[in-house]
């Protein structure tokens, strides 16, 4: 399976909400043999590999933000802990999973990584990740709402606030 990032760069004004999204796709065994662990974390662009470093998002670690379920089931993170930090990660039936960050500040700027780990009985884990940049801007140069720049060469899109 693979993970795709719909957008590689999000540029948002301070105070706005944003939803960062990844999609995982490929053959999915609907049986009991497979479990998917999905999570989010902040990182840095490593010299060898992007997303190797795992930093918390607003003091929540990747373990705090994980989703864990079988097949393409929907799931949400523990609401209380995440929402106290203005965060929510979620997953739908179509392979999309996202993290919503509310009331953005300049400190939220940085590289964000989504991670999917496929867990199978008697098989090694399969790990894939996606990376995207969030730039939070303030002042007269800031956009009025979030602008998302696609990972491919398509034109940028305005995305509605979460």
């Amino acid at each position: 399976f693979k993970v795709a990032t719909l957008y590689s760069l999000y540029v948002c004004p301070e105070g706005q909400n944003v939803t960062l999204t990844c999609r995982f796709f490929g053959p999915v065994d609907k049986g009991h043999d497979v479990t998917f662990y999905k999570t989010w974390y902040r990182s840095s662009r490593g010299e060898v590999q992007t997303c190797s470093e795992r930093r918390p998002i607003r003091n929540l670690t990747f373990q705090d933000l994980h989703l864990h379920h079988g097949g393409h089931q929907a799931a949400n993170t523990s609401h209380d802990l995440a929402q106290r930090h203005g965060l929510e990660s979620a997953s739908d039936h179509h392979g999309n999973f996202s993290i919503t960050m509310r009331n953005l500040t300049l400190l939220d700027s940085g590289l964000y990584c989504c991670l999917v780990v496929e867990i199978r009985h008697h098989h090694s884990e399969h790990r894939v990740h996606g990376a995207m940049e969030l730039q939070v801007q303030t002042g007269k140069d800031a956009p009025s709402s979030c602008v998302a720049y696609p990972s491919s060469s398509q034109e940028s899109e305005n995305i509605t606030a979460a």
Epitope: Y37, R54, I119
Partner: antibody
Framework: QVQLQQSGAELMKPGASVKISCKAT????????VEWVRQRPGHGLEWIGE????????HYNEKFKGKATFTADTSSNTAYLQLSSLTSDDSAVYYC???????????WGAGTTVTVSS | DIVMTQSHKFMSTSVGDRVSITCKAS??????VAWYQQKPGQSPKLLIY???YRYTGVPDRFTGSGSGTDFTFTISSVQAEDLAVYYC?????????FGGGTKLEIK
């Protein structure tokens, strides 16, 4: 805070079996692997295998197949390692550790000493 | 199985010295290497993950580097409390394997 509490030391006879426990607190037990590692006196660390409590998935080091059996009880957040047909070679400290999927052994138990002696 | 080789079983150093411990993988493991510290009578502790990143709360005198097959763990200024055995471990494929350990002795 994340903790793994292991059961106490065991003195066993050759040929017997022993079951070691590892109780997890401070995190979602079902969503991380529980690793088992052996350390014989004066030796290094040997990976026995792992269990994912959420699904019951297991991975065993070939060397320990037939010797070690992993189980996990999500109702009590406890993982177990059973060692069978004990010999003096099985005398060691046995550690459990947490490993979030796709990551490393980030929290370790204090270890359980198993001594096999007639 | 991937074999992790730590060429030195023992290293002797003095407080304040810089010391480096090496680890070689029998095949390419990218940056999927961790370093653990085990003090006498204690369980191992994660110090470095993904070859070069310090785990939470680890002092910045501990650093790691490398990728592929060759990895190095460095203590920039050894403290008395760093007396321990240091292990590398690959997390590229199961079975997860550890190096044989390097015992750091303080002169």
């Amino acid at each position: 805070q994340v903790q793994l509490q292991q059961s106490g030391a065991e003195l066993m006879k050759p040929g017997a079996s022993v079951k070691i426990s590892c109780k997890a607190t401070g995190y979602t037990f079902s969503s991380s692997w529980v690793e088992w590692v052996r350390q014989r006196p004066g030796h290094g660390l040997e990976w026995i295998g792992e269990i994912f409590p959420g699904s019951g998935s297991t991975h065993y080091n070939e060397k320990f197949k037939g010797k070690a059996t992993f189980t996990a009880d999500t109702s009590s957040n406890t993982a177990y390692l059973q060692l069978s047909s004990l010999t003096s070679d099985d005398s060691a400290v046995y550690y459990c550790a947490r490993r979030p999927p796709g990551w490393f052994f980030d929290v370790w138990g204090a270890g359980t000493t198993v001594t096999v002696s007639s | 199985d991937i074999v992790m080789t730590q060429s030195h079983k023992f290293m002797s150093t003095s407080v304040g010295d810089r010391v480096s411990i090496t680890c070689k993988a029998s095949q390419d493991v990218s940056t999927d290497v961790a370093w653990y510290q085990q003090k006498p009578g204690q369980s191992p502790k994660l110090l470095i993950y993904s070859a070069s990143y310090r785990y939470t709360g680890v002092p910045d005198r501990f650093t790691g580097s490398g990728s592929g097959t060759d990895f190095t763990f460095t203590i920039s200024s050894v403290q008395a409390e760093d007396l321990a055995v240091y292990y590398c471990q690959q997390h590229y494929s199961t079975p997860w394997t550890f190096g044989g350990g390097t015992k750091l002795e303080i002169k």
